[in-house]
């Protein structure tokens, strides 16, 4: 005998109590695939979690974190505390980046400043806890008497038009 449940679309469940009739998912539940024998309970975004997308009969609710926190884990299962720029979250809380490192976001770890000399460049703007260094031209390019990066335009004899 053919399983009538396979005909039940997403948003419904196969009701065995009613001769395998496809019944709509009850309020606050959903089925994201066809042929389901039960509907799943919708996720509720409470507390530190706020609703990003409401639950529908065919898809679960999606949560986000309130201001001051950011999502972690699959489907935002956790909200991690934000730190300030120039800090990182450690086992003991938000700590300032050590000298020579920076973090320009409210999450993640402090990263070392770029080493400009590895690319043969010089430091144009010093790094801070919140910002990486800005590398500029190589030191040789900046030394007095060094040839300019763009050669001067060739001089023309007066009265002659360019060829």
């Amino acid at each position: 005998l053919q399983d009538l449940c396979s005909n039940c679309p997403a948003g419904t469940f196969c009701d065995n109590n009613r001769s395998q009739i496809c019944s709509p998912c009850p309020p606050n539940s959903f089925s994201s695939a066809g042929g389901q024998r039960t509907c799943d309970i919708c996720r509720q975004c409470k507390g530190v979690f706020k609703t990003r997308k409401e639950c529908s009969s065919t898809s679960n609710a999606e949560c986000d974190c309130i201001s001051g926190y950011h999502c972690l884990g699959a489907e935002c299962s956790m909200c991690e505390q934000d730190c300030k720029q120039g800090q990182e979250l450690t086992k003991k809380g938000c700590k300032d980046c050590c000298f020579g490192t920076f973090n320009d976001q409210k999450r993640g770890i402090c990263r070392p400043w770029t080493n400009c000399s590895l690319d043969g460049k010089s430091v144009l703007v010093n790094g801070t806890k919140e910002r990486d260094v800005v590398c500029g031209p190589s030191p040789a390019d900046l030394s007095p008497g060094a040839s300019s990066a763009t050669p001067p335009a060739p001089a023309r004899e007066p009265g002659h038009s360019p060829q």
């Epitope: 507390g47 530190v48 979690f49 001051g68 926190y69 972690l72 884990g73 299962s77 956790m78 909200c79 991690e80 505390q81 979250l89 086992k91 003991k92 809380g93």
Partner: nanobody, 124 residues
Framework: QVQLVESGGGLVQPGGSLRLSCSAS????????MSWVRQAPGKGLEWVSD????????FYEDSVKGRFTISRDNAKNTLYLQMNSLRAEDTAVYYC?????????????????WGQGTLVTVSS
């Protein structure tokens, strides 16, 4: 090892107050968010309240907002739930629970340690 021990439950009349405590040990209490969760007779688990690691951010289930207050004393490694204006529907076993990651608030499914619970009965 991590231990969470609740106390303070009991029988109280409607409109009355109770203060639950949860004594924590075996982990750096001040680095973890904590929660209260309850289970009414014959019902499933219901999230009640969260508090972040430092105690400055608190969150509540709508039905207890304005009546319950979660707090913590990190020096004493203790979590509290002050329950005022109690109703019959607040009757439940109340559990305290620890969140799994430092400075992170998780969903109830992810709490990694739970206490044994304390029974609160609201009845005249």
């Amino acid at each position: 090892q991590v231990q969470l021990v609740e106390s303070g439950g009991g029988l109280v009349q409607p409109g009355g107050s109770l203060r639950l405590s949860c004594s924590a040990s075996g982990f750096t209490f001040s680095s973890y968010a904590m929660s209260w969760v309850r289970q009414a007779p014959g019902k499933g688990l219901e999230w009640v309240s969260d508090i972040n690691s430092g105690g400055e951010s608190t969150f509540y289930e709508d039905s207890v907002k304005g009546r319950f207050t979660i707090s913590r004393d990190n020096a004493k490694n203790t979590l509290y739930l002050q329950m005022n204006s109690l109703r019959a529907e607040d009757t439940a076993v109340y559990y305290c629970a620890k969140h799994p990651l430092t400075f992170t608030i998780a969903t109830m499914n992810d709490y990694d340690y739970w206490g044994q619970g304390t029974l609160v009965t609201v009845s005249s």
